[in-house]
């Protein structure tokens, strides 16, 4: 996963709705007990902002040595600074844990600009505003890395909460959810609620400042507003789901629906932007440079490198237009839509020279590697990850930013057929290179 | 592509001066302002001066009385001339302009672009 700015053919037939919204009680099936409810001691314990990453409180070791980590679902290894670095205020010193066991075995991971390495090991691991429950997991030290810790960030390390198939050096590597699950009672599921600010934070508003939860193991009822919608995990690497159809404003971008899920789409809350392949991406943009044409943009600021900047409180939300991605639903025939705002697309920067202004920067991109759901989306929506049940939440977030006229929204059912046609098979090769 | 071309940095002696000087090109958009900014090592980037599309300027005060902007519109340039330096002016030294893309090129929107910065260095 990149942190910062991370990601034969057929048409799925979109569309036609079935008819109104169940009530939350009847459109989700009963859960198993202990999976919903309240997590007082779980809400708001993330901090941090889409651009820099989500980080929870960790300890590791023993005694506990105290830990700020990056929250990813796009990476599937448990890493931590372990060597001084110009940018870690603390780092885990492994020889001061008196239960720390070293693996003897290094793990070397690239990505498309930078990389990170270090040495396996195990040791206690705890969440204090999670589970009461310590585990024994497998941490990557990490001794050495180049453009992979951000100046300013506040975290020191990387939780990869996807699966084995994806952790470095091989699948064997337990994941650290894995471990938990294995080794408690914490029922197999995990749901994030990411909470943008919709206005740029500086050092300390991010410190002072709320970004989320991470509830671990259920569902909090007071994270979301309205019903729950369910797409299956394709596939247990990446959290892989299936688009069945986009639409910008209303208006279908009518490509094939394989195009939207080449060569994946994945859930991931350590990318920044909303990713899509090269042809959706230049389809999107296009319609939304249609729907926005009242103004006249760099080049610049649609490949994202270039901020536009309004007098403070003048920022025209209204010629921005909604995107609305429909995923597989859990019924044959059967999608529902996650609806986001430009106030989800467009992300809030601040620079010295634009301070008093309302500033931002395009967080749509181009991917050669599929579709990426990254911060952008995931701000949205309160996102469950039911692994137990092989599936992936979505419901409104009851923290998104929206305004007085739209708000995000989460709608279904349709009916949608021949879905499984957009699902692309990569073709069986080595997976060991990170693209991310 | 916009460009913005910086030139004039170097070394003097406390009391010397120097004029800066940073040419915009490769956009058609109505420039709204040019400004200097700079930063020296260790601390943040702050506004030296500024200059709006209508000639109205704007001056850091540890600079008022010393240093001068100006611009010549005709060649999208800003210029900023640096009298009576002081081993406190010591920094990188950045151009910035305001690009307007609100409609009809107003400044009610607009783009901020940066120089790659010159470096002055005033010695006691």
């Known amino acids: 996963t990149q942190h910062g700015i991370r990601l034969p053919l057929r048409s799925g037939l979109g569309g036609a709705p079935l008819g109104l919204r169940l009530p939350r009680e009847t459109d989700e099936e009963p859960e198993e007990p202990g999976r919903r409810g309240s997590f007082v001691e779980m809400v708001d314990n993330l901090r941090g902002k889409s651009g820099q990453g989500y980080y929870v409180e960790m300890t590791v070791g023993s005694p506990p040595q105290t830990l700020n980590i990056l929250v990813d679902t796009g990476s599937s290894n448990f890493a931590v600074g372990a060597a001084p670095h110009p940018f870690l205020h603390r780092y885990y010193q492994r020889q001061l844990s008196s239960t720390y066991r070293d693996l003897r075995k290094g793990v070397y991971v690239p990505y498309t600009q930078g990389k990170w390495e270090g040495e396996l090991g195990t040791d206690l691991v705890s969440i204090p505003h999670g589970p009461n429950v310590t585990v024994r997991a497998n941490i990557a030290a990490i001794t050495e890395s180049d453009k992979f810790f951000i100046n300013g960030s506040n975290w020191e390390g990387i939780l990869g909460l996807a699966y084995a198939e994806i952790a470095r050096p091989d699948d064997s590597l337990e994941p650290f959810f894995d471990s938990l699950v294995k080794q408690t009672h914490v029922p197999n599921l995990f749901s994030l609620q990411l909470c943008g600010a919709g206005f740029p934070l500086n050092q300390s508003e991010v410190l002072a400042s709320v970004g989320g939860s991470m509830i671990i193991g259920g569902i909090d009822h007071s994270l979301y507003t309205g019903s729950l919608w369910y797409t299956p995990i394709r596939r247990e690497w990446y959290y892989e789901v299936i688009i069945v159809r986009v639409e910008i404003n209303g208006q279908d971008l009518k490509m094939d629906c394989k195009e939207y899920n080449y060569d994946k789409s994945i859930v991931d809350s350590g990318t920044t932007n909303l990713r899509l392949p090269k042809k959706v991406f230049e389809a999107a943009v296009k319609s939304i440079k249609a729907a926005s044409s009242t103004e006249k943009f760099p080049d610049g600021f649609w490949l994202g490198e270039q901020l536009v900047c309004w007098q403070a409180g003048t920022t025209p939300w209204n010629i921005f237009p909604v995107i609305s991605l429909y995923l597989m639903g859990e019924v044959t025939n059967q999608s529902f839509r996650i609806t986001i705002l430009p106030q989800q697309y467009l992300r809030p920067v601040e620079d010295v020279a634009t301070s008093q202004d309302d500033c931002y920067k395009f967080a749509i991109s181009q991917s050669s590697t599929g579709t990426v759901m990254g911060a952008v989306i995931m701000e949205g929506f309160y996102v469950v990850f039911d692994r137990a049940r092989k599936r992936i939440g979505f419901a409104v977030s009851a923290c998104h930013v929206h305004d007085e006229f739209r708000t995000a929204a989460v709608e279904g059912p349709f009916v949608t057929l021949d879905m499984e046609d957009c699902g692309y098979n990569i073709p069986q090769t080595d997976e060991s290179t990170l693209m991310t | 592509q916009v460009q913005l071309q910086e030139s004039g940095g170097g070394s003097v002696q406390a009391g010397g001066f120097l004029r800066l000087s940073c040419a915009a090109s490769?956009?058609?958009?109505?420039?709204?302002?040019m400004a200097w900014y700079r930063q020296a090592p260790g601390k943040e980037r702050e506004l030296v001066s500024s200059?709006?599309?209508?000639?109205?300027?704007a001056y850091a005060d540890s600079v008022k009385g010393r240093f001068t902007i100006s611009q010549d519109n005709a060649k999208n340039t800003v210029y900023l001339q640096m009298n009576s330096l002081k081993p406190e002016d010591t920094a990188m030294y950045y151009c910035?302009?305001?690009?307007?893309?609100?409609?009809?090129?107003?400044?009610?929107?607009?783009?901020?672009?940066w120089g790659e910065g010159t470096q002055v260095t005033v010695s006691s």
């Open positions: 490769g956009y058609t958009y109505s420039t709204c302002s």
């Open positions: 200059i709006r599309n209508d000639g109205s300027t």
């Open positions: 910035n302009i305001r690009i307007g893309v609100g409609p009809g090129g107003t400044c009610s929107i607009y783009a901020p672009y």
